[in-house]
């Protein structure tokens, strides 16, 4: 058993039938000696007299806010949340699982650039009585700062019968430094509690590996006189790092016939500029990848030929 | 470039960007193969790491890039080194196309490019002796290339940098 | 210094109305859901309903549903709970409460690290 706030206890169970749970003391927070009775959630039905209640914990009914009371007030509160761990692994209910990148992704992160901020996100079918907390540091045995913001319900969805409730979070390095190499990764701390339910997730990552720039801007097409060909031109995102001459992108771009099923060829350069042969009811698409570290590819950018 | 020289810019971007393609080629990205374990935060500790104070950002290279390259230079061979060892010669083989090969000598000709003969710099010492066993063997191989990749990425960061700001 | 003032409380008849409203200073509450608690006489603290941030999620207590409407508006930082067909057992202190923690509340009272010093709602048959 361990304290997350004041009054407020997670109680680690072993979860298989019959087993045994945990023995929790709780003690009344009082000078009182005598006359006190302790009473759970709601029910006015009393569960045991004096100063500490010895109770088994052994499943959901054992877990919720105890008070002792006397003489009809009470006196102390303590909530008790139930951590399972069910053949050695710790629950995960409350969130889905991404299976992006892989199976058991609980929490999946991007960064925009190396400038040490970064967003989290995570999915839930769970709408009310549901709480988080988020921690975030480099390194865990010397931990250096990240500061997360609040977060916020950041899309809703309904899959089938069911809603789903996209969650984020913002978090910023204290002290980043983007030309360097990483060496520690970041580490990410979810708890989630529902009902009288406790969880955390955790994810670890270096800022490179989770790069996605945000999609090249300002596609332009010029046609090129006496000719089937355009010249098409693209910036680098606002939101990349700075000097683009050290913080280099690469491009794929690709023509994309007005039927999916047609073969797209996709040309891969360093240069902002290319000439294609764009035909009339096709789109031209380009998208950005780290030209040195092989991150994800942003979302396209596309512009139609005509 | 010892003695504060310039070093052949864009030669050095050519050579440090082909090594990223090289390194990468050499372990593709498995769906994000996550090789960080318990414990890792101190073997990593083993590698040398283009770090904060070493001058490689765009400020630093323009006051005095020579801590940058002498930094660079440390690492590559050290890499060189580990590729060259029975960390990667040893069982389980190579395959015959493997580009360790290629990376490793690529590895070498950068550091040259950065050290003409007659110059030495110091060097950071070369790791233990390899694991005996053939899947752990594997493993460190995977290690060493997901952190290689990292390193060549700043290098080549650092070589572009230069070439387009620093050469004469 | 974070404060919570609850206001709107009164003497009002069965079958009446009344807005409450909680007015939060000393910081934002960006993210963290918010409840309204209430306490009768000689009774326990009970959940009466929560809010999230965004407004979109709320919850209510079995006794309350369909009489009572949670709502907030963060441009103010002032949540309100509108009481619609107050009962005799409606009479109660009501707390106004935050978390400091993220999502869409919780019912139990222990889940929040902000309160109100109440206002008092007094149903009359």
């Known amino acids: 058993i361990w304290e997350l706030k004041k009054d407020v206890y997670v109680v680690e169970l072993d979860w298989y039938p019959d087993a045994p749970g945990e023995m929790v003391v709780l003690t009344c927070d009082t000078p009182e000696e005598d006359g006190i009775t302790w009473t759970l959630d709601q029910s006015g039905e009393v569960l045991g007299s004096g100063k500490t209640l010895t109770i088994q914990v052994k499943e959901f009914g054992d877990a919720g806010q105890y008070t002792c009371h006397k003489g009809g007030e009470a006196l102390s509160h303590s909530l008790l949340l139930l951590h399972k761990k069910e053949d050695g692994i710790w629950s995960t209910d409350v969130l889905k699982d991404q299976k992006e990148p892989k199976n058991k992704t609980f929490l999946r992160c991007e960064a925009k650039n190396y400038s040490g901020r970064f967003t989290c996100w995570w999915l839930t079918t769970i709408s009310t009585d549901l709480t988080f907390s988020v921690k975030s540091s480099r390194g865990s045995s010397n931990p250096q700062g990240v500061t997360c913001g609040a977060v916020t319900l950041s899309a809703e969805r309904v899959r089938g019968d069911n809603k789903e409730y996209e969650y984020s979070v913002e978090c910023q390095e204290d002290s980043a430094c983007p030309a360097a190499e990483e060496r520690l990764p970041i580490e990410v701390m979810v708890d989630a509690i529902h009902k009288l339910k406790y969880e955390n997730y955790t994810s670890s990552f270096f800022i490179r590996d989770i790069i996605k720039p945000d999609p090249p801007k300002n596609l332009q097409l010029k046609p090129l006189k006496n000719s089937r060909q355009v010249e098409v031109s693209w910036e680098y995102p606002d939101t990349w790092s700075t000097p683009h001459s050290y913080f280099s992108l690469t491009f794929c771009i690709q023509v994309q016939g007005k039927s999916k099923r047609e073969k797209k060829d996709r040309i891969f350069t360093d240069k902002t500029s290319a000439t294609v042969i764009c035909r009339k009811n096709a789109s031209f698409s380009v998208q950005a990848q780290d030209r040195y570290y092989s991150s994800s590819w942003s979302e396209w950018a596309s512009v139609p030929c005509s | 470039v010892p003695g504060g020289s310039s070093p052949a810019w864009a030669q050095c971007q050519q050579l440090s960007q082909k090594l990223c393609t090289l390194a990468w080629s050499a372990h593709p990205l498995v769906g994000h193969m996550d090789l960080r374990e318990e414990g890792d935060e101190e073997t990593t500790n083993d590698v040398p790491h283009i770090q904060c104070g070493d001058g490689c950002d765009p400020q630093g290279l323009r006051d005095n890039s020579q801590f940058c390259l002498q930094r660079i230079r440390q690492g590559l061979i050290f890499y060189e080194k580990l590729l060259g060892s029975d960390i990667f010669t040893g069982e389980p083989s190579l395959l015959p196309d493997s580009p360790v090969g290629q990376l490793h000598a690529s590895l070498l000709g950068l550091s040259q490019l950065l050290q003409p003969e007659g110059h030495h710099w110091e060097t950071q010492q070369i790791p233990s002796p390899s694991p005996s066993q053939p899947w752990q063997r594997l493993l460190l191989r995977f290690k060493i290339l997901r952190s290689l990749q990292a390193f060549v990425a700043v290098a080549a960061r650092v070589f572009a940098h230069g070439a387009a700001t620093l050469s004469p | 210094e974070v404060q919570l003032v609850e206001s709107g409380g009164g003497l009002v008849q069965a079958g009446g109305s009344l807005r409450l409203s909680c007015a939060a200073s000393g910081r934002t509450f960006e993210g963290n859901p918010m409840g309204w608690f209430r306490q009768a006489s000689g009774k326990k603290r009970e959940f009466v309903a929560s809010?999230?941030?965004?407004?979109?999620?709320?919850s209510y207590a079995d006794s309350v549903k369909g009489r009572f409407t949670i709502s907030r508006d963060n441009a103010k930082n002032t949540v309100y709970l509108q009481m619609n067909s107050l009962k005799p057992e409606d009479t109660a202190v009501y707390y106004c409460a935050a978390s400091a923690r993220f999502g869409s509340g919780s019912y139990y009272d222990l889940m929040y690290d902000y309160w109100g010093q109440g206002t008092q709602v007094t149903v009359s048959s």
């Open positions: 809010i999230d941030w965004s407004g979109g999620i709320t």
